[in-house]
């Protein structure tokens, strides 16, 4: 997701098919306020960014609204009137879905079903990760809708759960971003807990003398 051009590193993120964020690391332009100009149709005039991201008092990015029918972003980053980087990109490649909303859990014997509100667009995977204090790594399960059942749980154990949304590679390509994780929720015997004990780390083997 990083494009290079004349010492400029670019990162694009398309948040939930709603907002595009383009950020840059302008190593060759210290203390310069680079300007960002963009359009979603080749035939339009460029608009200048109205919501800049600032870093140490200087521009380092732009946030712009997009609509689901907008698919190509044409943009130019300029130092004064001089374009230092110009590109056009399919913005779907840089999709970052929003985190799961309205997450709820239902327990039935040795299984738990996590549900949340599905996002309004297709080509997504809803991933649930879970672990008990006996697990050193998160276990994972994912589905095409936000209705994910994890089976073969031990009701006596405390489990931590978290969820996120990922864009399917077959729909958006391999260079998208997963959503941020939802808050970790802990459950034991079908009830919420403030926390679970930390996972046990296996003891280090003693070296024989």
């Amino acid at each position: 997701q990083v494009a290079t051009g004349e010492g400029l590193q670019i990162q694009i993120m398309y948040f939930n098919l709603e907002t595009v964020q383009v950020t840059w690391n302008a190593s060759h332009y210290p203390r310069s306020n680079l300007s960002f100009h963009y359009k979603f149709s080749r035939d339009e005039a460029y608009d200048q960014c109205t919501v800049y991201i600032l870093q140490e008092g200087h521009t380092s990015g732009c946030l712009l609204d997009a609509e689901q029918q907008d698919d190509i972003l044409y943009f130019s980053i300029r130092n004064g009137t001089h374009p230092v980087f110009t590109a056009s990109r399919w913005i779907f490649y840089y999709l970052k879905p929003s985190s799961p909303k309205q997450v709820s859990f239902s327990w039935h014997q040795d299984a738990v079903t996590l549900t949340c509100s599905d996002l309004s667009y297709r080509g997504l995977l809803y991933e649930v990760q879970y672990r008990s204090p006996f697990d050193t790594e998160w276990q994972s399960k994912q589905e095409n809708t936000c209705n994910v059942t994890v089976e073969d749980l031990d009701a006596e154990k405390c489990y931590a759960f978290r969820a996120r949304v990922k864009a399917m590679e077959d729909a958006y390509g391999p260079d998208t971003y997963p959503s941020d994780w939802s808050e970790v929720t802990c459950w034991q015997r079908g009830e919420t807990r403030d926390s679970c004990p930390e996972p046990r780390t296996p003891p280090k083997p003693k070296l024989s003398k």
Epitope: Q1, V2, A3, T4, G5, I10, I72, Y74, A87, S88, R89, W90, F92, Y93, G123, E169, D170, A171, Y172, G173, P174, D175
Partner: antibody, heavy 122, light 107 residues
Amino acid sequence: QVQLQESGPGLVKPSQTLSLTCTVSGFSITTSGYYWSWIRQHPGKGLEWIGYIGYNSKTYYSPSLKSRVTISRDTSKNQFSLKLSSVTAADTAVYYCARSLYGGYKDAFDSWGQGTLVTVSS
Amino acid sequence: DIQMTQSPSSLSASVGDRVTITCRASQSIGTSLHWYQHRPGETPKLLIKFASRSISGVPSRFSGSGSGTDFTLTISSLQPEDFATYYCQQSPGFPPTFGQGTKLEIK
């Protein structure tokens, strides 16, 4: 299995309009997500993308050819067509039709026609 | 437009050789780089998608790697039917653009 076949005149006079049709068999051009392209190859040169038409009729054209290109479709015949106006000798090329592998996001071209040579000459 | 530069532009090799073709993008394209084989008189054929993902029906001797701006197509052991022209193509930039091609000939 999808098959694509280009057809149209092999010789076009300068300043006229080049017209080609791609007939698709074994797959509907209205299948959700898929995009259909024209790509050309000048003699002894590399490949140049001309434009797409989508399952939803949306079109995208190469910026360098946009003013002269029209891509349309006839769903009843499962065909899509290319029109390139005001041709010159520089438009002499083998013209291919192709399908985009990942529907909505228009990535790789996974199925191609055999190609048809179009010569622009008076 | 994103420029795609392939090297070498032509290459002579023998059956059984290991061959590497490189493709460089003028801007970073992540892993959205695809490789094609074009034999004379045939339709171009997709070999590798997204830099390294294999395509059903394509022999395993074809592999790809790379990300960002530098990519490689490797043929582990050349077969007689592999003598052809190979093209790379980027897809995140608009318009899609191809490399100029690498012609693989019999030594």
